[in-house]
Each structure stands twice: as C-alpha cells, then as structure tokens.
Amino acid sequence: SEVEYRAEVGQNAYLPCFYTPAAPGNLVPVCWGKGACPVFECGNVVLRTDERDVNYWTSRYWLNGDFRKGDVSLTIENVTLADSGIYCCRIQIPGIMNDEKFNLKLVIKPAKVTPAPTRQRDFTAAFPRMLTTRGHGPAETQTLGSLPDINLTQISTLANELRDSRLANDLRDSGATIRIG
C-alpha cells in the first residue's frame, strides 16, 4: 500500500523520492505523475527529468532538492483539496525491467484557522492566514495576529461583517475550518 503524506490547504506539499546516481552527473530519467504508477513511465505526467536536467514540468510542481545528487522529491506549491490522491515517482534505471516505482498518497486537510489572543476586531487576526516557507521538508506554517477567548457569536459577526472580503472567499472556497478553543 502507498505511504501517506499530509499537507494543509495553502501549504506546500513534499513527496520524497531518492536514488543514488552511479556517478556524479550520471543521472537517470525520473518522472512524476498524478495517479498510481502505470506499467510504463508515468500517467498524467507533472514533471520529468532526463539524463541532464528537468525537461518537463507543470505549474506548481518542482524539485526543491538537488536532483543531480538523486534527490528527486516533489514539491507541490500552494496545495488545494484537489491535489489529494496518489502520486507516482518512477526512477527509470537503465537495463531490462529495472525501474523503481513508488506510489505516494497525498492527503490534503482543510487549513486550520486558529482564533487568537487580543480583542482587536481585525479579520486577519481572527482568521490568521497560513504562510508557507520553501524548504526541503513539509512546509512550515506561521500564523499572523492573535487573540484569546473569541466565541462563536463573535466569529459569526466578524464573518458577516466581512463576508465580501477576498479572504472570506478564500476561506470558503478552500473549505477551511475554524477551530474553537
């Protein structure tokens, strides 16, 4: 069964995949695809490398590690719920039926929006946005603003007052949830 990896909406997701090049610069073609690994290559290819470089990629998908040293881990930028599913990393080692293939399951959770410690009626404080940092591991999350005991009524009022704001739309569209306590 697939190894499972998790990320939140708005974060960068990280799917690890590695191999050891036979010699420095002696690279092996690798493909990443959305969906389990098929019989050959990758289905729905999102990124591909050849013996020298990344030769195909699509928006939001990139290799953050040093692929010339065999780190072909995939980063998916600013994930949405639609990015959930199985991904295939296929390392096309030369020879007769030598491919290494890995199915990785990505689970995307709605962003946790944590209410916070001061009474300012500021939407970004009551509904902190998640910031992501690019790095090798899963994206780190940071929250802006803060405030203590905010109750459901206050949240409801804030949301009503600012329901036309872009952030409110973002929260609705991404299925973000508000956690109390």
Epitope: P29, G35, A36, P38, V39, F40, E41, G43, N44, V45, D50, E51, I86, Q92, I93, P94, G95, I96, M97, N98, D99
Partner: antibody, heavy 117, light 107 residues
Framework: EVQLLESGGGLVQPGGSLRLSCAAS????????FSWVRQAPGKGLEWVSA????????YYADSVKGRFTISRDNSKNTLYLQMNSLRAEDTAVYYC??????????WGQGTLVTVSS | DIVMTQSPSSLSASVGDRVTITCQAS??????LNWYQQKPGKAPKLLIY???SLPIGVPSRFSGSGSGTDFTLTISSLQPEDFATYYC?????????FGQGTKLEIK
C-alpha cells in the same frame, strides 16, 4: 504526417532470426516509449516488448525474454526488434505502437512473420 | 499476470442500437484501462484511454466507464463503420495484457 511503418517480416525457419524495423515520422520520436505488439493469425493481441525514450530501459514478455531484443536509433527515428531462436508460435503480425499517457495511441500497419519449415 | 476477461465474446446488433461491452480485470488496475477497435486486416485503433478519456478524433458516441476491476465500453448509437472487434487492455500491472476481444457483427 504522423505515422509508423514496419518492415522486415517474412518467412523464416524455426531457430532462425529476423530483424523488424519501424520507421516513425511526423513527431518527436525520442520523447516516447514504444512497444511491439503481435497478433497470431485469427487470435487476439499480445504485448511483446517495450523501450524507453532514451533506449536505455527495456521490457519483455516472458514468452520472448532472452530471444528477442528491442532497440531504437533516435537519430534515424527507427525502432527495431531483433528476433532470434524463432519458434512456430512466434508466427504473427507484428505491430509497433507508440505509448502515450498509458495507451498505445499510434500503430503501424503491421508486418507478417511466418516461422515454418 | 493480470487477466482481462471480456464479455460477450461476440455480439450481433443493428445500426442505431446502443451496445455495451464489459471487461473485468483479475485485480484492481487503478483505472488504467484502454479500449481498441480493430477491423479485419488493419491495425488496432485507440478508442478510450484511462477508462473514460476519448482521444482526439474519436466520435463522441463511444464512451468508457468503470473503476477497480470492472469496466464498460458503450457505443450509444451504432454506425455501419463500428462493426469490428474490440479489445480492452490494462496498463497498470506488468506485463500489459489484453482481453480476448469482442466481435461486433451486423444483425
């Protein structure tokens, strides 16, 4: 025009050898995996062999492993199948087929290989 | 090897009929199921890939569905040029394998 054209089929005795060719045109040949698929007279389709775009990864059905060798020359846009130690059960029409997004989306017209004494 | 079983093996139908051919895999194939049409003396032609996707140029009367192990090819309204043999093929497990074929004949 996008097409594949096989050649090299014919009559050969059991134990003999034959080399099939498949000339591609109209697309970026080196970007695709290719396969050979065969069809015995009056029978269904059987996958035989496949090769990666750079030619360095190859794949074979158990029925032909050790006897057949798939290769390609990307500078000539040509795919090959070297068939050795041929048997009567290898008699079939051999098709080359381009593999794209998990399907064989482009096929040649086929070349008939007959193994008989 | 993954065994692909098609049914029926042969089928008689008339122009304008709706026809369904089924294909069952011996194990789950993650939707990696293709359908091909072959006419006598000709090479196969890809009709459906990835269970339900239509290649450019294939008429919309052809459709595919299914997941896991059970898949279906439907021709919504048979045309004279549709009488042929149809094969399913799985592209998940090694080696790729084909069904035994379904011969669609004129009634």
């Amino acid at each position: 025009e996008v097409q594949l054209l096989e050649s090299g089929g014919g009559l050969v005795q059991p134990g003999g050898s034959l080399r099939l060719s498949c000339a591609a045109s109209g697309f970026s040949f080196s970007s695709f995996y290719f396969s050979w698929v065969r069809q015995a007279p009056g029978k269904g389709l059987e996958w035989v062999s496949a090769i990666s775009g750079n030619g360095r990864s190859t794949y074979y059905a158990d029925s032909v492993k050790g006897r057949f060798t798939i290769s390609r020359d990307n500078s000539k846009n040509t795919l090959y199948l070297q068939m050795n130690s041929l048997r009567a059960e290898d008699t079939a029409v051999y098709y080359c087929a381009r593999y794209y997004n998990t399907g064989f989306d482009l096929w040649g017209q086929g070349t008939l290989v007959t193994v008989s004494s | 090897d993954i065994v692909m079983t098609q049914s029926p093996s042969s089928l008689s139908a008339s122009v304008g009929d709706r026809v369904t051919i089924t294909c069952q895999a011996s194990e789950a194939i993650y939707g990696y199921l293709n359908w091909y049409q072959q006419k006598p003396g000709k090479a196969p032609k890809l009709l459906i890939y990835a269970a339900s996707s239509l290649p450019i140029g294939v008429p919309s009367r052809f459709s595919g569905s299914g997941s896991g192990t059970d898949f279906t090819l439907t021709i919504s309204s048979l045309q004279p040029e549709d009488f042929a043999t149809y094969y399913c093929q799985q592209a998940y497990g090694f080696p790729p394998t084909f069904g035994q074929g379904t011969k669609l004949e004129i009634k």
